[in-house]
Amino acid sequence: AAMGSCSKEYRMLLGQLQKQTDLMQDTSRLLDPYIRIQGLDIPKLREHCRESPGAFPSEETLRGLGRRGFLQTLNATLGRVLHRLADLEQHLPKAQDLERSGLNIEDLEKLQMARPNVLGLRNNVYCMAQLLDNSDMTEPTKAGRGTPQPPTPTPTSDVFQRKLEGCSFLRGYHRFMHSVGRVFSKWGESPNRSRR
């Protein structure tokens, strides 16, 4: 959905959410280009790129929340994701540096699409919450917060460590989006029914 506009059609909105989460769990759109750009595309380094436990809610946790709780948790988690993506973005090499080192500009462009894509997903999460008449969630483009957010660890200043932390975060993010997609796939045909 474009900024500020919400579809009132449940099935259409659910379809958009499922499509968005399908795209966002695809590592070729974010993690893989990040690994290439940051020079982590070496087997020994790839081994260090593991998801940090507890960085994202588990699928089991998400399934136990109920629709409104799930949307609130998703909203808050995407809020933190937006910050982490912005932080990763600001430490990426510049386009001209990539060209000089023979790296792919397309990889940089993929990484720079991540934040707007998350923004689009978050807007649709807000729209779905509105459709389910959830008055507790604030509009994502305005101030306020959906649910309290656990503190985010301050990123390290060590360049290599920062790259690995980014890699771990993105791996966790893709896994989380896979879990989110699985939860949405269980939602029923109407706002009032849920498949088990």
């Epitope: 809020g79 720079q112 934040r115 483009t141 305005k142 306020g144 917060r145 957010q149 301050t154």
Partner: antibody, heavy 121, light 111 residues
């Protein structure tokens, strides 16, 4: 009334330091990302730095990174800009600005009146 | 960095006439259905004030004579019927990526 009031500006020699403050009132400060934007005399606007609502994330213009530090104290509803190794080209009115989005950055919807920083020998 | 080029640098328009300001980005500031472009008005001795955000959404309290349009790299701010109180410098701002950059400004005066 939503208000931002900057202070701490003044005359400083090249290489010197200055700490700007911004006192916020009329809104829940801890719910908003905050930024500093500057304007050299007779010139246009330039974004300088942004800090996330909780203070965990900071973002800087390349030519101030390593010299300037943005920070906040949510308990005191205050935003700060520590400026070290100041240069003549840092001379400007520094505005404190509220960011409309708390989770990432859209645009600045509330501005202070600014504080003038002059770097000169 | 994305460079924002505003034109014209200055503009003199008769009261009640249309004023058009353009802003061109060195690369697209639109993505995923969003236009990361915003317009500000700055009167002498005052801080900037947001007029239009997301390229075309008018900030509450802003008169409807102000409108914004565009996507990708080319954006326009239009004042449909210039009033005396519209004399100011107008700036575009992109928030697509870091660093956020403003256009150089357009000074609007009464002819």
């Amino acid at each position: 009334e939503v208000q931002l009031v900057e202070s701490g500006g003044g005359l400083v020699q090249p290489g010197g330091s200055l700490r700007l403050s911004c006192a916020a009132s009329g809104f829940t400060f801890s719910n908003y990302a905050m930024s500093w934007v500057r304007q050299a005399p007779g010139k246009g606007l330039e974004w300088v730095a942004t800090i996330s609502d909780g203070g965990s994330f900071t973002y800087y213009l390349d030519n101030v990174r390593g010299r300037f530090t943005i920070s906040r104290d949510n308990a005191k509803n205050s935003l700060y800009l520590q400026m070290n190794s100041l240069r003549a080209e840092d001379t400007a009115v520094y505005y404190c600005a509220r960011d409309v989005g708390h989770t990432t950055f859209w645009y600045f919807d509330v501005w202070g009146r600014g504080t003038l920083v002059t770097v000169s020998s | 960095d994305i460079v924002m080029t505003q034109s014209p640098d200055s503009l003199a328009v008769s009261l009640g006439e249309r004023a058009t300001i353009n802003c061109r980005a060195s690369k697209s500031v639109s993505a995923a259905g969003y236009n990361f472009m915003h317009w500000y008005q700055q009167k002498p001795g005052q801080p900037p004030k947001v007029l239009i955000y997301w390229a075309s959404t008018r900030e509450s309290g802003v008169p409807d004579r102000f409108s914004g349009s565009g996507s990708g790299t080319d954006f326009t701010l239009t004042i449909s019927s210039l009033q005396a109180e519209d004399v100011a410098v107008y700036y575009c701002l992109h928030s697509r990526e870091f660093p956020f950059t403003f256009g150089g400004g357009t000074k609007v005066e009464i002819k």
